[in-house]
């Protein structure tokens, strides 16, 4: 599977006005990534995975460049012509990909109420369009518009091109993604407690992404919640992450206890050692 | 009607440049698409050199970048092939091509690379 | 760069037969980037199936394309005489643009 990053940006206009603000969503490796709300864009993590690697430089950039690319598919959206009453919605789906033999591609896709009517290969400029008539007259008038206004701001396609996979190189760089999936190491730990007590403990490490499922059972049965203890899953600064669940049990009955992993589709059974 | 006629010299000396023109009638190459160099070495298959699209963009093929350039006169509706420092293995026929899915091409034209 | 490799090098086949050739890419192709040409001796290649299976204008029904991501195919469902060529196809996903080695269509 190839590294991708892609930014999903949503417009809306109401009875032919274009509404302010805009939704944004970026997606790294297929995970959520960041997404900016509806009427002030401000970059957010999507979750600790995010936040812990990336620092505020990348949600500042990345806040700006959204706010930026926002306004543009606005302007577009003002410039579709015979817009009907009621709610619409123009939606830019930008992707970059970095393939195992280290070729690239990129792309960008406009829906115009959830239906698709223009393409452009990014990286060699090339547009296809559906064969329906009525995406054929949106894509003709988006453009020409478009091809227009990259006159004036003398930017062009190969420059967004070569933006996001200059962004997914740094995510990539940054160790915030290392693979689709990384299987943990599982290992299983005793220490004494109290008399006749000892508290056996369940580490996982190296995995990614950060989803996993810990959890100690005694006879095949899952013990309740208050009865263990989990750690937070933390990066472990290799780009992939650790955790840990302990419990304390009687002295004797270890052969009755094991540690569940599930991770990505796949689980283990993990017993403490004699 | 779409068509497209490369012209330049049949012969050029070795280390010297070789210089190609496409011109192009029946379609402005401003409007649309990528307008391509490909050559084919005697009795081997197609290789792609570079293109310059409807907006300017030039792309190359790595592996003759540092001595390709393409460039283009909208006035005259032409494209042209620069290749420097040329040797044997530059002899070939060179065609001209629209789009990306090359649906025009030129008749070509021989190129040989002999002192 | 992609990689295109055509299979057979070389096909020999009696009029009326079904041509099958392959071509095959070292990374994944969007099919809508992906073209068959078909170049008879002394002649400029020409257009022969766009965005893996589209006619192009002119071409004989009788040819026809399909595939997706790595594994391409064109097909001549009844060879007639005039098939003779060298069939190459090509990938525009990425740069650089290239084209497979070709394979050589003979009539018996």
């Known amino acids: 599977e190839p590294h991708s990053l892609r930014y999903n940006l949503t417009v809306l206009s109401w009875d032919g006005s274009v509404q302010s603000g805009f939704l944004a969503e970026v997606h790294l490796d297929g995970q959520p990534f960041l997404r900016c709300d509806r009427q002030k864009c401000r970059a957010k993590p999507q979750g600790q995975w995010a936040e812990d690697v990336l620092g505020n430089k990348t949600w500042d950039r990345e806040t700006r460049d959204l706010t930026g690319n926002g306004k543009d598919l606005r302007m577009t959206l003002a410039h579709i012509k015979d817009q009907k009453e009621g709610l619409h919605s123009l939606q830019e789906i930008r992707v970059c990909e970095i393939h195992e033999d280290n070729s690239t591609r990129s792309s960008q896709h406009f829906y115009y109420d959830g239906e698709l009517f223009l393409s452009q290969n990014l990286e060699t400029e090339e547009w296809t369009m559906p064969q329906s008539s009525r995406a054929q007259t949106l894509a003709m008038n988006v453009r020409n518009f478009l091809k227009e206004d990259a006159m004036k701001t003398k930017t062009h396609y190969h420059a967004m091109h070569a933006d996001c996979l200059q962004e997914l190189r740094r995510y990539l760089k940054s160790g915030v993604v290392l693979r689709r999936t990384v299987p943990p190491m599982v290992n299983v730990t005793r220490s004494e407690a109290s008399e006749g007590n000892i508290t056996v403990t369940c580490r996982a490490s190296g995995f990614y992404p950060w989803n996993i499922t810990l959890s100690w059972r005694q006879d095949g049965v899952s013990l309740s919640h208050d009865t263990q203890q989990w750690g937070d899953v933390l990066p472990d600064g290799n780009g992939t992450y650790q955790t840990w669940v302990a419990t304390r049990i009687c002295q004797g009955e270890e052969q009755r206890f094991t540690c569940y992993m599930e991770h990505s589709g796949n689980h283990s059974t993990h017993p403490v050692p004699s | 009607q779409v068509q497209l006629q490369e012209s330049g010299p049949g012969l050029v000396k070795p280390s010297e440049t070789l210089s190609l023109t496409c011109t192009v009638s029946?379609?402005?190459?401003?409007?649309?698409?990528?307008w391509n160099w490909i050559r084919q070495p005697p009795g081997k298959g197609l290789e792609w050199i570079g293109f310059?699209?409807?907006?300017?963009?030039?792309k190359y093929n790595p592996s003759l970048k540092s001595r390709v350039t393409i460039s283009r006169d909208t006035s005259k509706n032409q494209f042209s092939l620069k290749l420097s420092s040329v040797t044997a293995a530059d002899t070939a026929v060179y065609y001209c091509?629209?789009?990306?899915?090359?649906?025009?091409w030129g008749q070509g034209t021989t190129v040989t690379v002999s002192s | 760069e992609i990689v295109l490799t055509q299979s057979p090098a070389t096909l020999s086949l009696s009029p009326g037969e079904r041509a099958t050739l392959s071509c095959s890419a070292t990374?994944?192709?969007?099919?809508?980037?992906f073209h068959w040409y078909q170049q008879k001796p002394g002649q400029a290649p020409r257009l022969l199936i766009y965005?893996?299976?589209n006619l192009a204008s002119g071409i004989p029904a009788r040819f026809s394309g399909s595939g997706s991501g790595t594994d391409y195919t064109l097909t001549i469902s009844s060879l007639e005489p005039e098939d003779v060529a060298v069939y190459y196809c090509?990938?525009?996903?990425?740069?650089?643009?290239?084209f497979g080695q070709g394979t050589k269509l003979e009539i018996k």
């Open positions: 990374s994944s192709i969007s099919s809508i980037y």
């Open positions: 091509a629209r789009g990306y899915g090359f649906d025009y």
């Open positions: 965005r893996t299976s």
């Open positions: 310059v699209s409807y907006s300017g963009t030039t």
């Open positions: 029946g379609y402005s190459i401003t409007s649309d698409y990528a």
């Open positions: 090509q990938q525009g996903t990425t740069i650089p643009f290239t």
